[in-house]
Structure formats: structure tokens, C-alpha cells
């Protein structure tokens, strides 16, 4: 067995509606049947969990209903979307992939995607 590497884009710009999407790709060293994907946010030296989902290979990944994340999976690639972002949420978002089953367990951590969020300017009052 060898190390698992995780790739993700260096920079992503959120849309004006506060939505950011990026791909998290991992090189699976084994035949995993159960995979857990976690999005972490690193600000200074503090790391917090944004969202997480476990899925069985071949099935869709499902986040909790109240999660700000959605995603789809295709092979060793996960397409992640984070919603409801505001300027204060600008930061480094790290993709963490765990191959949970069968053993051995593998952990892979991406270098992080810097997500820039710009709050939209409020519409000026119109005289018309």
C-alpha cells in the first residue's frame, strides 16, 4: 500500500450569490468501498469542520439536510459546492478524504483551496 494523495484547486472565486464549487480528487491506493469526505476551514492556526459526508463507492454522497455543502461523486473525484458564503468566510478550505473500509484506513489531506468571497454591492435606490 502507498500514501493517498488529495488534489484540489489552489484558488476559487465564489459567485455573487455566495456559492463556491471545486473538485477534490484523490488517488486511491486500495479498493475502498466506504469513503468519508470532510471540508475543513483553516483560519490562522484554527481548523474547523465545515461539512462532512460518507458514501459508498458507486453511490452518491449525501450531506446532512442542514449542511451548507452539496456534492456529487464520480470514481475518485468529488465535486463539492459550498453555499451561503459571505466575505467573512473567505479563507482556506481543505479537502480531507478518509478511506474507511475495508482496512487499512487511509487519510489524505489536500493543500487547501483559497476561496474568495465578495459580498455583492447593495442595489442603489432608484428614483423610478
Amino acid at each position: 500500500c502507498k500514501a493517498m494523495h488529495v488534489a484540489q484547486p489552489a484558488v476559487v472565486l465564489a459567485s455573487s450569490r455566495g456559492i463556491a464549487s471545486f473538485v477534490c480528487e484523490y488517488a486511491s491506493p486500495g479498493k475502498a468501498t466506504e469513503v468519508r469526505v470532510t471540508v475543513l476551514r483553516q483560519a490562522d492556526s484554527q481548523v474547523t469542520e465545515v461539512c462532512a459526508a460518507t458514501y459508498m463507492m458507486g453511490n452518491e454522497l449525501t450531506f446532512l439536510d442542514d449542511s451548507i455543502c452539496t456534492g456529487t461523486s464520480s470514481g475518485n473525484q468529488v465535486n463539492l459546492t459550498i453555499q451561503g458564503l459571505r466575505a467573512m468566510d473567505t479563507g482556506l478550505y481543505i479537502c480531507k478524504v478518509e478511506l474507511m473500509y475495508p482496512p487499512p484506513y487511509y487519510l489524505g489531506i489536500g493543500n487547501g483551496t483559497q476561496i474568495y468571497v465578495i459580498d455583492p454591492e447593495p442595489c442603489p435606490d432608484s428614483d423610478f
Epitope: C1, K2, A3, M4, H5, V6, T38, L40, V47, T48, E49, I94, K96, M100, P103, P104, Y105, Y106, L107, G108, I109, G110
Partner: antibody
């Protein structure tokens, strides 16, 4: 601040069992994976076992597989290690440690000494 | 399991000198999953470096980590009296997680 306090160590005869406990405070226990690491007298560190934050996943070192059970009670902020069929080579200081979100261990207890001897 | 080998076993140096400690893995380890710990006699270990090169909170910048694949290095740029201790590397990328046997840094 983060505190991990181990208990349950002592002298035990070969073949007997022992349960170690670790009382955690100063952080949200239910959000962290927890590990046991041991150190035989005058020797290096040996990773023993890990349990996920919710207890859903557990892994063990080959040296204790089949003899050790790691468990946790999130309502009591307590981690456990049940060791059965103890051997002389299980003699060590057992450390309770906290896992961080990025996978590494960042806090250690002061350890509890287990001596397996007849 | 991944076997970690540390060298040298003992490093005898004087305060102010540079210490270079090596950790070699029996197979490739993700650089995101390699940590270094310091242990002084009678004390629990303390996290120094995680992710091969990230300093833990409160660790002085004289400690630095580098490496990838199977070869990793911990460097102490200028040894202070409190740095004389045993240093362990650990991989946490593949279960079972494993520690190296340690390198003792003592005063020459």
C-alpha cells in the same frame, strides 16, 4: 485548557484483564478522535488504538489486536481501553491522546503505568 | 504496516549548534500525515510539527520540518538548553499508525 487524566493502571498478573480510563475536559470531547499510545520503560512510543469521535470506527496496533478494545462515553467525556490476556510486554505507561481534525495527535495526558508481573 | 526508521540514534551537540534529524519510511507517506514530537525525561511527549512542515501552536521557529515520500527531516536551527530531549516521528496516514524509534539529542 485541554486536560486528559488517565487512571486504572497498576500491577496485574499475566493473563488477567485491566480497564484504563481517561477523563477529558477543556474541549468538546465528542468532536475529536481519541488515541491510546504506550511507552515501555526506557523504550520508545508505540501507537495502540484509535476511536473516531462518535465511536463508529476503531483501529488497533497488531500487537494488541484481538486483546484490546477502545471505547468512549461521550456523555461522560471519558475514553476507555480494555486490555485482556495481558502479557509482560504490555508493561508500559499508557497515554491518552487527542486527535485533531487534520489527523495528528495534539494533546497528551500524563500517562498511567501498567505493570504486568506475577 | 509502515516502519519508520530514525537516524542517528543519538546526536551529541553543543548549545547553539544546528541539529538535523532524519525519519525514513519503509513506504511512501503522505507529507500531510507526518508529525514530530519532543519528549523530555519523565514528561509526556509534545507535538512540534504536523503535516511534515507545519509548526504546532507555541513552537519556536527554530524548529522546522521538511520532506516528502519516504524521507523527512526535523531541523533545529540553533539548539537551546531546553531542546536536549528525545524526538519521535509518526505517520498517521495509514493504519496502523506508527512511530519511529526516536533520536536522542544530548549535550556534547
Amino acid at each position: 485548557q485541554v486536560q486528559l487524566v488517565e487512571s486504572g493502571g497498576g500491577v496485574v498478573q499475566p493473563g488477567r484483564s485491566l480497564r484504563l480510563s481517561c477523563a477529558a475536559s477543556g474541549f468538546t470531547f465528542s468532536s475529536h478522535g481519541m488515541h491510546w499510545v504506550r511507552q515501555a520503560p526506557g523504550k520508545g512510543l508505540e501507537w495502540v488504538a484509535v476511536t473516531w469521535y462518535d465511536g463508529s470506527n476503531k483501529h488497533y496496533a497488531d500487537s494488541v489486536k484481538g486483546r484490546a478494545t477502545i471505547s468512549r462515553d461521550n456523555s461522560k467525556n471519558t475514553l476507555y481501553l480494555q486490555m485482556n490476556s495481558l502479557r509482560a510486554e504490555d508493561t508500559a505507561v499508557y497515554y491518552c491522546t487527542r486527535g485533531e481534525l487534520l489527523g495528528y495527535v495534539d494533546y497528551w495526558g500524563q500517562g498511567t503505568l501498567v505493570t504486568v508481573s506475577s | 504496516e509502515i516502519v519508520l526508521t530514525q537516524s542517528p540514534g543519538t546526536l551529541s551537540l553543543s548549545p547553539g549548534e544546528r541539529a538535523t534529524l532524519s525519519c525514513r519510511a519503509s513506504q511512501s507517506v503522505s507529507s500531510s500525515c507526518l508529525a514530530w514530537y519532543q519528549q523530555k525525561p519523565g514528561q509526556a511527549p509534545r507535538l512540534l510539527i504536523y503535516g511534515a512542515s507545519s509548526r504546532a501552536t507555541g513552537i519556536p521557529d527554530r524548529f522546522s520540518g521538511s520532506g516528502s515520500g519516504t524521507d523527512f527531516t526535523l531541523t533545529i536551527s540553533r539548539l537551546e538548553p531546553e531542546d536536549f530531549a528525545v524526538y519521535y516521528c509518526q505517520q498517521y496516514g495509514i493504519s496502523p499508525f506508527t512511530f519511529g524509534p526516536g533520536t536522542k539529542v544530548d549535550i556534547k
